[in-house]
């Protein structure tokens, strides 16, 4: 199979995130481009007939000329070790170090880049690239789908006839990984937030690195944390009111460990919601602020939104929990006005608390209003 996507993600990782070159025109950027070119040349035999390969080759040529990079010169040392595809280890490792992502990562390079994705409320999505969207996405949707992990959410309408939905079911599949974990499935539904996998276990099974996957109950029936140390990943699942929230911290290289971008690469945490599934909640917020709750029918995805919840009350309730007027605050106001359910205030509050715990860049905890983002 063609491995051009590995080249793409290595280049992406080398030129984005906290370790990125300060400017596109630095020698480091050209070095990263030359590494990318070398990587694509190596894959030519198995990728030469595929669009992804030719796109990469032409993209490299364009970037090389745009940035006046010479074809000869230093290449960047890969910052990332390459995670073997799930189940691809050819020899048994008797050391549990392979099951501790950071320990094995430090052998190869600096601290990994971590990213965050969260889903909460009506639902609001914060992607791995810090885009913030409000989506309809009724039914089952892939939140994460990579070589190690699959997360699927099911969203149901919060009110009859409403386009606004919230998460009623969450399924997480941890794929079999080397000598660390057996395949494990976690499933949560409304009013059922278990502190165990579906087989009743609380860790990764019988393998010698089984404790690199662990479920911890933080608050019974309300808050569960899953640590997958073998892939450097932490997941927080909460039940707030009737609905579920999801938050994850994951290394960039795990985020991008996707075999087939056609099928896997469309997952919400990476690409965001499709444009036809997005709700422009910022325009809604502006309308509501300017004209009061009576005008909601024009902007609201929930024509049956209760008029008994005045805009001022929604603002006051959200301000109480979310004093900074960021997108989490705006999401809170939107949810109160569209559902009349005060629990959505807590959903936004806890989502922000999870960001504080899981996001690696403390300058990006709060996101602020901007033009609506298009999907990636």
């Amino acid at each position: 199979p063609c491995k051009i996507l590995k080249c793409n993600s290595e280049f992406w990782s080398a030129t984005s995130g906290s370790h990125a070159p300060a400017s596109d025109d630095t020698p480091e950027f050209c070095a990263a481009l030359r590494s990318y070119a070398l990587c694509t040349r190596r894959t030519a035999r198995t990728c030469r007939g595929d669009l992804a390969y030719h796109s990469a080759v032409h993209g490299i040529e364009d970037l090389m000329s745009q940035h006046n990079c010479s074809k000869d010169g230093p290449t960047s040392q890969p910052r990332l070790r390459t995670l073997p595809p799930a189940g691809d280890s050819q020899e048994r490792s008797d050391s549990p170090e392979i099951c501790h992502y950071e320990k094995s990562f430090h052998k190869h390079s600096a601290t990994p880049n971590y990213t965050h994705c969260g889903l909460f409320g009506d639902p609001h999505l914060r992607t791995f690239t810090d885009r913030f969207q409000t989506c309809k996405v009724q039914g089952a949707w892939p939140l994460i789908d990579n070589n190690y992990l699959n997360v699927q959410v099911t969203n149901t309408p919060v009110l009859p006839g409403s386009a606004a939905t919230a998460t009623s079911k969450l399924t997480i599949i941890f794929k079999n990984f080397q000598e660390c974990v057996d395949q494990k499935v976690y499933q949560a539904e409304m009013d059922e937030l278990p502190a165990a996998f579906v087989d009743g276990s609380k860790n990764g099974g019988d393998k010698h690195g089984a404790n690199s996957l662990k479920i911890t109950e933080k608050v019974s029936g309300q808050h569960v944390e899953i640590q997958a140390k073998y892939i450097g990943t932490t997941i927080v699942v909460r039940q707030v009111g009737r609905y579920l929230t999801f938050a994850v911290r994951m290394p960039e290289e795990v985020v991008n460990a996707v075999e087939d971008w056609d099928s896997q690469g469309l997952y919400l945490c990476l690409r965001g919601c499709p444009l036809n599934q997005q709700i422009d909640f910022q325009a809604f917020h502006t309308n509501a602020e300017g004209t009061g709750a009576r005008r909601l029918a024009a902007a609201s995805p929930a024509p049956t939104a209760p008029e008994t919840f005045p805009y001022e009350t929604a603002v006051a309730k959200c301000k109480e929990k979310l004093p900074v007027e960021d997108l989490y605050y705006q999401a809170c106001v939107f949810d109160l006005l569209t559902t009349g359910d005060v629990n959505f205030t807590l959903a936004a509050y806890y989502a922000l608390e999870d960001v504080k715990m899981l996001h690696s860049n403390k300058d990006k905890l709060h996101l602020y209003e901007r033009t609506r983002d298009l999907p990636g």
Epitope: R42, T43, R45, D50
Partner: antibody, heavy 115, light 112 residues
């Protein structure tokens, strides 16, 4: 789920022509190179040729060069193999397979060249 | 053209035992910087071939970890650590390093 379904096989006389089709689903057909491979009765596998995602290049095995032509219609998610001047040694099951190097294969279609 | 010679032609193994087969190339299959495009396929009776191993040692998605590929240059080996009933069939090696792409003649795995 990747699916490849070949059709168009049958019994033909030596010297005649036949065109096989392979309809793809479960992946973005227009993004991938595609291959044809064949297997003579009770024999091993023989690579026939491949075509790039945009038909810009085609590569063939020496045994079929000049007689066989691979083409594709991305709007129909369909790969073709046009076979001319057929010989008895072309009798085989013909498989289409996804990728520049084959990963997923169709179920195959039988072509018998006999007088 | 690159000729791939597979040995043995057939192999009879007891369930649960290890099976080992070889694929030897008429020229080196190393393409660039250690990349070697040698794959293994299994063709079960009455079925299409399915990809097991790519780039010498990487298992394709869904392939059990009892299949272990190894080798370099011109000599390659596929081992099945504990043979199961569904493993019977013909195993083909395949090279994509040089044009034209070529298959080995196959090793038939039978269950004792």
């Amino acid at each position: 789920e990747v699916q490849l379904v070949e059709s168009g096989g049958g019994l033909v006389q030596p010297g005649s022509s036949l065109k096989l089709s392979c309809v793809a689903s479960g992946f973005t057909f227009s993004n991938y190179g595609m291959n044809w491979i064949r297997q003579a009765p009770k024999k091993g596998l023989e690579w026939i040729g491949m075509i790039y995602y945009d038909s810009s290049e085609k590569h063939y095995a020496d045994s079929v060069k000049g007689r066989f032509t691979i083409s594709r219609d991305n709007s129909k998610n369909t790969l073709y193999l046009e076979m001319n001047s057929l010989r008895s040694e072309d009798t085989a099951i013909y498989y289409c397979a996804k990728g520049t190097t084959p990963d997923y294969w169709g179920q195959g279609v039988m072509v018998t060249v006999s007088s | 053209d690159v000729v791939l010679t597979q040995t043995p032609v057939s192999l009879s193994v007891t369930l649960g035992d290890q099976a080992s087969m070889s694929c030897r190339s008429s020229q080196s299959l190393e393409y660039s910087d250690g990349y070697t495009f040698l794959e293994w396929f299994l063709q079960k009776p009455g079925q299409s071939p399915q990809l097991l191993i790519y780039e010498v040692s990487n298992r394709f998605s869904g392939v059990p970890d009892r299949f272990i590929g190894s080798g370099s240059g011109t000599d390659f080996t596929l081992k099945i650590s504990r043979v199961e009933p569904e493993d019977l069939g013909v195993y083909y090696c395949f090279q994509a390093t040089h044009d034209p792409l070529t298959f080995g003649s196959g090793t038939k795995l039978e269950i004792k």
